[in-house]
Each structure stands twice: as C-alpha cells, then as structure tokens.
Amino acid sequence: MAVTACQGLGFVVSLIGIAGIIAATCMDQWSTQDLYNNPVTAVFNYQGLWRSCVRESSGFTECRGYFTLLGLPAMLQAVRALMIVGIVLGAIGLLVSIFALKCIRIGSMEDSAKANMTLTSGIMFIVSGLCAIAGVSVFANMLVTNFWMSTANMYTGMGGMVQTVQTRYTFGAALFVGWVAGGLTLIGGVMMCIACRGLAPEETNYKAVSYHASGHSVAYKPGGFKASTGFGSNTKNKKIYDGGARTEDEVQSYPSKHDYV
C-alpha cells in the first residue's frame, strides 16, 4: 500500500513539477525591470526566453520575439536548451511512469518490469528537475552579473551633459516558478526511485522448503504456489518468488506482500 502511495504521490508531484517547468519556460517574466532606486519610468520592461515585453503606464503591452538565433547570447541559448531538455525528459518520464503505476494494470506486465519502468521514470524526473534548476540558476547568475555591471556604470554619459539611464533587470516570477517546479520534479523523481525499491521482486530463489502441517505433508516446489492436497483452504500457503512467469489470474488472486507493508 505504501509503495503504491509513494509511487502515486511521486507521479503527481512530478506532474505538477513538469507543468511548472513548461509554464516557466513559456513565461515572459524571467527578468523584470528593477524598480528600486531607479528613475520612475512610465514603462515596465520584462523579458523571457523567447521574447521581450514592454508594458506602458496606459496598460498597453507590446512584445517582440527574439527572431534571431545566432545573435542571442550563448547563455540564453544554453538556458533554453536546458529547459527544453528538462521538459522533454519530464514528458517521457511521465509517459513511462503512467505505465509503471501499480494501480494501472496493462496485460500481464510483471512487477519487475513495473519496477524498472518506475526507476527509469524516476531518474528521468530527477534529471529533468536538475535541468530546470540548472537553467534557472544559470539565468539568475547572468542577471546578477549584468545587474552589478549596469549598477557600476548606471549613468553612462557622453561629455557629461547627456545621460543614458541603463535599465537594470532583476529576478522575474518565472525564475521562482522554475526553481519550485524543478524542485518538485526532483522530489517526485526521488519518490519514484524509492517506490521502485518496494516494487522490485526479491532476488532470492529458494530451492525447496518443506514443513509438516498436522496430518498432512505439503511440499512447496520452486515454481509453484502450492502442491494441491485436496483439502479446502490454503490461506496459510506462502508464495515463493522465483522470478518465473505467472498467469494473469495469479497476479490478481495473490497480491504481493509489499501491498501490505
């Protein structure tokens, strides 16, 4: 039960995280005009990964896409790449994890296969989250560097008379969305990996186990659930995993011990 809950929760947390990464990537407010200790402007500038926008005091907003590819800073390209890789890995991870969910039965898929898929999706989520966190952090670092550079020469004058006020940019909402979303995806991935351990069948193959029940001899052989005795209830019979194939009925009739952890 705890494994199913951990896996399900990991999936949901990762889903929210990846939705957040997608939202952050699409958002325009990666960097916003710094309003503190600046001349009060009648416009508000903000920039995203794909376009820059200006909101005028009237409320009129104008956005321009970055139509050049080669003319953009390498760091911006790197951030774009990290975010896209994060989204792609996350999307694939989500797809894999759907099939790996314990509560969803697909054909005669074994627990070991589900465990492997859970681990795969977990790793994908972890890498996806790390990509998003790295992307946002690189952009934030770029902003901090530019902020102090523009502060150092905030007023760059020609001959001292005419001044050009440099617009300083600070952290936009998308950065915080990205950090949180990346963190959630990472946590979801870790949860999936933890769930995988619970899903994985025990590796030990028992050669033979026999014990004497009162009046009856019941031998357990590797590969079977029980040796039929012709007597009614078999609720005391213990399933011995051997990694062998089982029928769908067996999967349904005999829940794994891990469901009751």
Partner: antibody, heavy 120, light 113 residues
Framework: EVQLVESGGGLVQPGGSLRLSCAAS????????IHWVRQAPGKGLEWVAY????????YYADTVKGRFTISRDNAKNSLYLQMNSLRAEDTAVYYC?????????????WGQGTTVTVSS | DIVMTQSPDSLAVSLGERATISCKSS????????????LAWYQQKPGQPPKLLIY???TRASGVPDRFSGSGSGTDFTLTISSLQAEDVAVYYC?????????FGQGTKLEIK
C-alpha cells in the same frame, strides 16, 4: 466623440483649498489613465499628476506633492484633483488629459481647461 | 527630473516653406526594452488646449496632416512642417513620456513671416 470637461476652478486665497473635477464621456473611462496638466498665464505646460486605470498607480509633480491629491470614480466617469495649501504659483489653467492607450504614454485628448486663481 | 530644451524659442517662416523645431532631452528617451523613443509633440493654438501631433518621436496621431513629421532618437528630436500653412501658427511643445515626472519643453512659437 471623446470629451473631457473640467470644472471647479475659481478664485481662492493662498492656503485655501479647491476641488477640480473632470467629467469624461465618449469612451470607456475605466480603460484609461488620466493626467492633470496646468498652464500658468503666458507660460508653458506643466504636468501635475497622473492616475492609472484602476487607481493603483499615482504620480505627482514635486511641486504639488503632499498638497494635491488625484482620485477617480470610474462608476461616475469622473476624475478629481483635491488642491490644498494653495499658493500664488498654483494659479493656472488646469487641463485633464487622457493617456492614450497605444500612443507611447502621450496624452491624446485634452479638456478645455478650468482656471484656478490663487490671490489674496 | 528630465530637462527638455527646445530651440528656437520663436520661429518665423513663410507660407509654404519648411519649419523645423528642435528638442533636446537631458537623458535618453529611448527605452531599451523595445527600442522605442518616448517623446511627443503637441500643438497649442491661442485660447485652445494642446493637441497631440506626434507620439513615439515619429508616429503621427490620428487626423494629423502628413506635412507634420517627427524624427530623432535618444536625446535629439525634430519636428518638421514640410509646407507651412496659415493654420499651423501655434506654440509647439515637446514632451518626455518615459520618465516621471513627465516634462515639457518650454515651447516654440511659430509665426508666419
């Protein structure tokens, strides 16, 4: 047709108060920021104050800060300028002007103005 | 505050001739975010309120004749009337629309020679 009509001007003694009004019609008042601009006799234009669409952003000229208060009532399509502690240098024609939506913050429509005279 | 300086203070031009008014700002009115200039030109005829002629340094407001044109960028701007008409006699003001407090030039009085 866009119309802005100012009222409330008159003669007031120094230190006195006056409340100017600006009635708007012919456009959706709540969609636009509005400015007050004044012009002293024989002088140039001087921007006084600005209020945004939803009154969330308000700016004043340094010369009137702390003495003048701009406000608006979108339900009544009206703009106000409460002027306290009036001085002789506040004598001017006061215009209300609409901040254009896509005119790079320029004022696209102006009222005819109302005259304020501060004198003892 | 941004200081707007117009020149000349007054100008006399013959009908049909070109009139040029200059405006300089103490700081650049070019917004880095969209590479647009936030400068407007107004015309004020005697006894009337100002009328918007040009915004964004070069865009004519609706209903403004095409003989009026604006140019310039950053700190130096120009209003040009290509062929002066009698009805163009007025005072012309430039205005900073980028920084609060919004500031106007002192005005240029245009007359017919």
């Amino acid at each position: 047709e866009v119309q802005l009509v100012e009222s409330g001007g008159g003669l007031v003694q120094p230190g006195g108060s006056l409340r100017l009004s600006c009635a708007a019609s012919g456009f959706t008042f709540s969609d636009y920021g509005i400015h007050w601009v004044r012009q002293a006799p024989g002088k140039g234009l001087e921007w006084v104050a600005y209020i945004s669409r939803g009154s969330s952003t308000i700016y004043y000229a340094d010369t009137v800060k702390g003495r003048f208060t701009i406000s608006r009532d979108n339900a009544k399509n009206s703009l106000y300028l409460q002027m306290n502690s009036l001085r002789a240098e506040d004598t001017a024609v006061y215009y209300c002007a609409r901040g254009g939506y896509d005119t790079r913050n320029a004022m696209d429509y102006w009222g005819q103005g109302t005259t304020v005279t501060v004198s003892s | 505050d941004i200081v707007m300086t117009q020149s000349p203070d007054s100008l006399a031009v013959s009908l049909g001739e070109r009139a040029t008014i200059s405006c300089k700002s103490s700081q650049s009115l070019l917004n880095s975010g969209n590479q647009k200039n936030y400068l407007a030109w107004y015309q004020q005829k005697p006894g009337q309120p100002p009328k918007l002629l040009i915004y964004g340094a070069s865009t004519r407001a609706s209903g403004v004749p095409d003989r009026f044109s604006g140019s310039g960028s950053g700190t130096d701007f120009t209003l040009t009337i290509s062929s002066l008409q009698a009805e163009d006699v007025a005072v012309y003001y430039c205005q900073n629309d980028l920084y609060y407090p919004l500031t106007f030039g002192q005005g240029t009085k245009l007359e017919i020679k």
